[in-house]
């Protein structure tokens, strides 16, 4: 997360970090009891490492009383999901048995409705991605609040250049922004799961160029479909 | 500060039900969920379940189901624990607490003595 | 359900003695471990989470420690406040379960 700040600790009861041989590699968001939704792309970066996920964590490195790590029985990327396309950016892992839900476990109520999010729209994106330009990464989660950007300004020349789909989301990235390390991590409405961070190469905290999110209300019959 | 009020005394006929209050003040209700403790005389603690107020979401023991219904309401800041079917064995302490991100019950009440008896 | 048995039901004890409660889980608990005290008059209080952290508050003769199955609390300096009845409580596997609990009474 750029230009953001340390976020309350476990107030965001939905977070989880996805890690592959104990290393942070993605975000993501437990949204029920046995399932992390994250960005597809994580997958590959993570070769034939045994990927868990992390929940009830603040700190990566920090021992702390709700912290913890899960392995992972079933990774189910999107099935339209490409290496060279951020098109279908999903990942559902089911975990390798239910999450113990409780202050600092919860899963995140997901949009439905596929509706567009109203331009300006203040979003919550959190993360434990690098915090700056040189590659720090924080131990602590981090988050920002940034303003939901129309898809027309999103698909200019200058910017995305018609890149992002109807499935797809942008969000202002001047100085603010989310960036490596929190693709798969979630993009939070009015307290309701929008969009998940995408999992590109994208340059992070130039404004022409923003952030993009994959609709999770666009994809809503196949995570019901993973989930039944 | 922080006060979990809970009546000291109730007492109820076999077979009858009983819904404990547990009046919260002092923070924001929904921001914590509320656990629920039993103990019977000269006995230790057993944990009956926990609730969260701001969707009401629960974990119950399995000794407890069908014993125990847990429920909040949010408007007055009081968690209640409906105990049916009672009988001598539900004779005890009950005790709600405030359960936080630590995993641990930071406030308790000063606990109700419920006494089933004809 | 995971047991958790403190086999000292009762302990006699002196003003600043340095007393040591233990506490033993049925199963590997990895350190998700709380410590709770109650006053003769019913009052319960949270002193130790995580195994090793003292709550806010708690005066600071009070330490916990353990790992794996075996735990333990320690007063380092007994004072007449301390005289209670300590409980371990275990947050690994659902159901929460508590100790039995140790009574400390004075000699």
């Known amino acids: 997360i750029l230009g953001g700040r340390e976020a309350e600790a476990h107030a965001r009861p939905y977070m989880a970090s996805v890690q592959v041989n104990g290393e942070h590699l993605c975000g993501g968001v437990l949204v029920a009891e046995q399932w992390v939704l994250s960005a597809a792309h994580c997958l590959e970066d993570a070769a034939d490492g045994k990927v868990q996920v992390l929940l009830g964590a603040h700190s990566l490195s920090q021992p702390e009383p709700s912290k913890r790590l899960y392995d992972v029985l079933r990774a189910v990327p999107h099935p339209d999901s490409r290496p060279d396309t951020i098109d279908h950016d999903l990942l559902l892992l089911q975990l390798s048995e239910k999450a113990t839900l409780g202050p600092a476990v919860r899963p995140l109520p997901w949009q439905r409705v596929d509706r567009d999010v109203e331009p300006g729209t203040l979003c919550d994106v959190a993360g434990w991605g690098i915090v700056s330009h040189a590659g720090r990464r924080p131990d602590r989660l981090q988050h920002v609040l940034l303003p939901v950007l129309d898809r027309a300004t999103c698909n200019r020349r200058t910017h995305h250049d018609g890149a992002i789909t109807q499935r797809m989301m942008c969000a202002e990235s001047n100085r603010r922004d989310s960036c490596k390390g929190d693709s798969g991590g979630p993009l939070v409405c009015g307290g309701v799961l929008e969009g998940v961070v995408t999992s590109g190469s994208r340059v992070c905290g130039n404004r022409k160029k923003p952030g993009i999110y994959t609709r999770v209300a666009s994809y809503a019959a196949w995570i019901d479909s993973v989930l039944a | 500060q922080v006060q979990l009020q809970q009546p000291g005394t109730e007492l109820v006929k076999p077979g009858a039900s009983v819904k404990l209050p547990c009046k919260a003040s002092g923070y924001t209700f929904t921001s914590y969920w509320m656990q629920w403790v039993k103990q019977r005389p000269g006995q230790g603690l057993e944990w009956i379940g926990e609730i969260d107020p701001s969707d009401t979401y629960i974990n119950y023991n399995q000794k407890f189901k069908g014993k125990a219904t847990l429920t909040v309401d949010t408007s007055s800041t009081t968690a209640y624990m409906q105990l049916s079917s009672l009988t001598s064995e539900d004779s005890a302490v009950y005790y709600c607490?405030?359960?936080?991100?630590?995993?641990?019950?930071?406030?308790w009440g000063q606990g109700t003595t419920l006494t089933v008896s004809s | 359900d995971i047991q958790m048995t403190q086999t000292t039901s009762s302990l006699s004890v002196s003003l600043g003695d340095r007393v040591t409660i233990s506490c033993r889980a049925s199963q590997d608990i990895t350190n998700y471990l709380n410590w709770y005290q109650q006053k003769p008059d019913g009052t319960v209080k949270l002193l130790i989470y995580?195994?090793?952290r003292l709550h806010s508050g708690v005066p600071s003769r009070f330490s916990g420690s353990g790992s794996g199955t075996d735990y333990s609390l320690t007063i380092s300096n007994l004072e007449p406040e301390d005289i209670a009845t300590y409980y371990c409580?275990?947050?690994?596997?659902?159901?929460?379960?508590f100790g039995g609990g140790t009574k400390l009474e004075i000699k």
């Open positions: 607490a405030r359960y936080t991100t630590i995993m641990a019950s930071d406030y």
């Open positions: 409580q275990q947050y690994s596997k659902l159901p929460w379960t």
């Open positions: 995580f195994t090793s």
